[in-house]
């Protein structure tokens, strides 16, 4: 039975040209995290494998940095980066947990962080 929950940074906004940290945290489970995938819609951004380390997808290699922790740092943001991001936790023995973050990249200098929320 899957007892864990994923806490994410929720709905966030950032300025064009700036950077943002995407963070997820898995709690309420003793399952072992074997791999975390970061995806934007159906596109793979990065993989953090517990044994093998990080892989950054080539199309994002110049503006995605691994970390902090299992998170992901997006740099040189453009308006096209606006959209849904998913952290997909592969765990043993529980299985897969998915968290969702919505990022809005703003033209103006007004960029506020949204509230945190949980996805069971």
């Amino acid at each position: 039975m899957m007892t864990g929950t994923i806490e994410t940074t929720g709905n966030i906004s950032a300025e064009k040209g700036g950077s943002i940290i995407l963070q997820c945290h898995l709690s309420s489970t003793t399952a072992q995290v074997t791999q975390v995938n970061w995806e934007q819609q159906d596109q793979l951004l990065a993989i953090c494998n517990a044994d093998l380390g990080w892989h950054i997808s080539p199309s994002f290699k110049d503006r995605v940095a691994p970390g902090p922790g299992l998170g992901l740092t997006l740099q040189s943001l453009t308006v096209n980066d606006t959209g849904e991001y998913f952290c997909i936790y592969h765990t043993y023995p529980d299985g897969t947990y998915t968290g969702r973050i919505f990022l809005e990249v703003l033209e103006s200098s007004v960029a506020e962080h949204g509230a945190r929320f949980q996805i069971p």
């Epitope: 793979l44 093998l52 892989h55 290699k61």
Partner: antibody
């Protein structure tokens, strides 16, 4: 030590089928994205296709010349990669190598010796 | 279909620097990899993810990838570096090899 050993090659008639195997050892096979690459006699390297890890969907991608004829699969419980080749053509004659896709700094390794597939009537 | 272009041959004197280029549309948006193959042997990965060297590959091998061109550079080329070199464009959906370059150490 990372090791890949290909097998299953041989002589087959045009239109025939063959299944190649690749036994992997020395690394966590289930996390690896694996590709098949071939080399025709005296020619260059040609990518055949790949299969991603189950944790990345286990999906497959193929080069245009083999799409619809070749199928890549994996058995993570046996640390084995497969290539099923149907409707073989003379131009499929080559040494076939299985390889680890270079995703991770901690998982790059040598190629195997390959297995020769000869398609001839 | 995506294509990579390499010069068929490159010659270099021992101790000099050899540069082998690989060109393809927006190659810089993919990862560039390089393989060395000597006659009768299986290929060896010498550069991956544009500029990283696998363990056991000498420091004289280096790589770069930007725009439409990836480059393999061998500093202080040795006789043992004479081989065929293949570039590879790698991304999450497909892989393509170049036609290969024969490096001759004069």
């Amino acid at each position: 030590e990372v090791q890949l050993v290909e097998s299953g090659g041989g002589l087959v008639k045009p239109g025939g089928s063959l299944r190649l195997s690749c036994a992997a050892s020395g690394f966590t096979f289930s996390y690896a994205w694996m590709s098949w690459v071939r080399q025709a006699p005296g020619k260059g390297l040609e990518w055949v296709g790949r299969i991603k890890s189950k944790t990345n969907g286990g999906t497959t991608d193929y080069a245009a010349p083999v799409k619809g004829r070749f199928t890549i699969s994996r058995d993570d419980s046996k640390d084995t990669l497969y290539l099923l080749m149907n409707s073989l053509k003379t131009e499929d004659t080559a040494v076939y190598y299985c390889t680890i896709d270079p995703l991770y700094d901690l998982l790059t390794g040598p190629w195997g010796q390959g297995t020769l597939v000869t398609v001839s009537s | 279909s995506y294509e990579l272009t390499q010069p068929p041959s490159v010659s270099v004197s021992p101790g000099q620097t050899a540069s082998i280029t690989c060109s393809g549309d927006k190659l810089g948006d993919k990862y560039g990899c390089w393989y060395q193959q000597k006659p009768g042997q299986s290929p060896i990965l010498v550069i991956y993810q544009d500029s990283k060297r696998p363990s056991g590959i000498p420091e004289r091998f280096s790589g770069s990838n930007s725009g439409n061109t990836a480059t393999l550079t061998i500093s202080g080329t040795q006789a043992m570096d004479e081989a065929d070199y293949y570039c590879q464009a790698w991304d999450s959906s497909t892989v393509v090899f170049g036609g290969g370059t024969k490096l001759t150490v004069l």
